[in-house]
Interface confidence: low
């Protein structure tokens, strides 16, 4: 594993130390992507190919497989879900200044949230902003999401499982055209059910990464690299959220 | 039955237009991805536009960029490409197509476009 | 000019298997994007053989099978037949949510 310093995460930046993100990275899990364990979806037993036919279950076949806000049909089944309304953005990058100006942050209010939450991101996501969630989790927890969207696509779906085969891993992945991609698995997992947590997630030029309890957990490259048009994040799963929100750093 | 019939192709002059259209039926339109590929005579496929179920995002080759604009219309099921500015290289046949699955699962026979003088 | 390098052309007997390679880039097949693979026989439309690297829609049968390392991705075609002979195409998505397509394979069964 590398040693990473938020200076070598952020260089260039001008900002070595930028507000509200964890100053010290400590030993990172292996980067997405490349590390043991990733895996193909259907590479466990009993799991069938994900967008498949009617009755055949989507990768990482447990219930609500994955991410799947209630009522929702399972990734991929056939037919997919409609896409979102609206007329398709312009091409190009919001700047951070025109977009989101450093005064944030933006988001919901203070105070319980209703769970599945959608956190909209005007202009999408850009590289310095920060992403805080604050919640508790729920006793018994089985899961947890962070779907950062794009129309009917999921650029980003960050999937704490609780117990998948007895075991506690983070899924990261992204649906495109209906469809589940090749999932990258973290067995570091910081989450404890009946306790409170603090979820960072940093957009950066390449990647998203993800801290936990200022503690830094994982980096997710860019799959979807129009960024401007990733415009709202869900919230779901086994939790009493209490706060969303996001500032330019 | 799942079929797409793409009509509209005909012979054109360069720098002419051209509107080819693409009726789907045997599933809900409005829920799919669709896209325009084409294939020019004795050569291999080329993608050319891509447009989601609500119309919300649409995507183009650069090869045509400027030129060439995918619409649907998800009352009528059907999918449409306006293409401007044709040129020789354009002559191709062009297949409506349905995305899904990781791959484009359903095809249609597609509609022969030349361009010639 | 085509992303995916494909063979031109492969050659089998009947009841032999071969292997049609696709090499892209980590922007398309290698990066944690979905390949498909399509037979398109003379004057005919396409038709979708595998999907998500290695998924075959009903009705295609289990001779044909997918896989991909790295960049690269192949498609195995195992006990080869008659009606196996067609142009061989694969495709991938790609970041920029455009596709990019091989430039065809010929299967010519001897």
């Known amino acids: 594993a590398d040693n990473f310093s938020l200076h070598d995460a952020l260089s260039g930046s001008g900002n070595p130390n930028p507000q509200g993100w964890p100053g010290a990275w400590g030993n990172q899990p292996a980067g997405a992507g490349g590390y043991p364990g990733a895996s193909y979806p259907g590479a466990y037993p009993g799991q069938a190919p994900p967008g498949a036919y009617p009755g055949q279950a989507p990768p990482g076949a447990y219930p609500g497989a994955p991410g799947a806000y209630p009522g929702a049909p399972a990734p991929g089944v056939y037919p997919g879900p409609p896409s979102g309304p609206g007329a398709y953005p312009s091409s190009g990058q919001p700047s951070a200044t025109g977009a989101y100006p450093a005064t944030g942050p933006y988001g919901a209010p203070a105070g319980p949230l209703i769970v599945p939450y959608n956190l909209p991101l005007p202009g999408g996501v850009v590289p310095r902003m920060l992403i805080t969630i604050l919640g508790t989790v729920k006793p018994n927890a089985n899961r947890i999401a962070l779907d950062f969207q794009r129309g009917n696509d999921v650029a980003f779906h960050f999937n704490p499982r609780f117990n998948e085969n007895n075991r506690r891993v983070i899924v990261c992945n992204t649906k495109l055209d209906n469809n589940w991609g090749r999932e990258e698995r973290q067995s570091v997992f910081p989450f404890e059910s009946g306790k409170p947590f603090k979820i960072q997630v940093l957009v950066e030029p390449d990647h998203f990464k993800v801290a936990v309890n200022d503690a830094h957990l994982l980096q997710y490259n860019h799959r979807v690299k129009k960024l401007n048009e990733i415009s709202k994040l869900g919230i779901s799963g086994d939790i009493d959220l209490t706060s969303a929100s996001y500032t330019m750093i | 039955e799942v079929q797409l019939v793409e009509s509209g192709g005909s012979l054109v002059k360069p720098g002419g237009s051209l509107r080819l259209s693409c009726a789907a039926s045997g599933f809900t339109f409005s829920n799919y991805n669709m896209n325009w590929v084409r294939q020019a005579p004795g050569k291999g496929l080329e993608w050319i536009s891509s447009i989601y179920g609500s119309s919300r995002y649409i995507y183009y080759a650069d090869f045509v960029k400027g030129r060439f604009t995918i619409s649907r219309d998800n009352a009528k099921n059907s999918l449409y490409l306006q293409m401007n500015s044709l040129r020789a290289e354009d002559t191709a046949v062009y297949y409506c197509?349905?995305?899904?699955?990781?791959?484009?699962?359903?095809w249609g026979r597609g509609t022969l476009v030349t361009v010639s003088s | 000019q085509s992303v995916l390098t494909q063979p031109a052309s492969v050659s089998g007997s009947p009841g032999q298997s071969i292997t049609i390679s696709c090499a892209g880039t980590s922007s398309d097949v290698g990066g944690s994007y979905n390949v498909a693979w399509y037979q398109q026989h003379p004057g005919k439309a396409p038709k979708l053989m595998i999907y998500y690297d290695s998924y075959r829609p009903s009705g295609v049968s289990n001779r044909f099978s997918g896989s991909k390392s790295g960049n690269t991705a192949s498609l195995t075609i195992s006990g080869l037949q008659a009606e196996d002979e067609a142009d061989y195409y694969c495709?991938?998505?790609?970041?920029?949510?455009?596709?990019?397509f091989g430039g065809g394979t010929k299967l010519e069964i001897k």
């Open positions: 495709s991938s998505y790609t970041g920029y949510s455009t596709r990019v």
């Open positions: 197509v349905r995305s899904s699955y990781g791959g484009m699962d359903v």
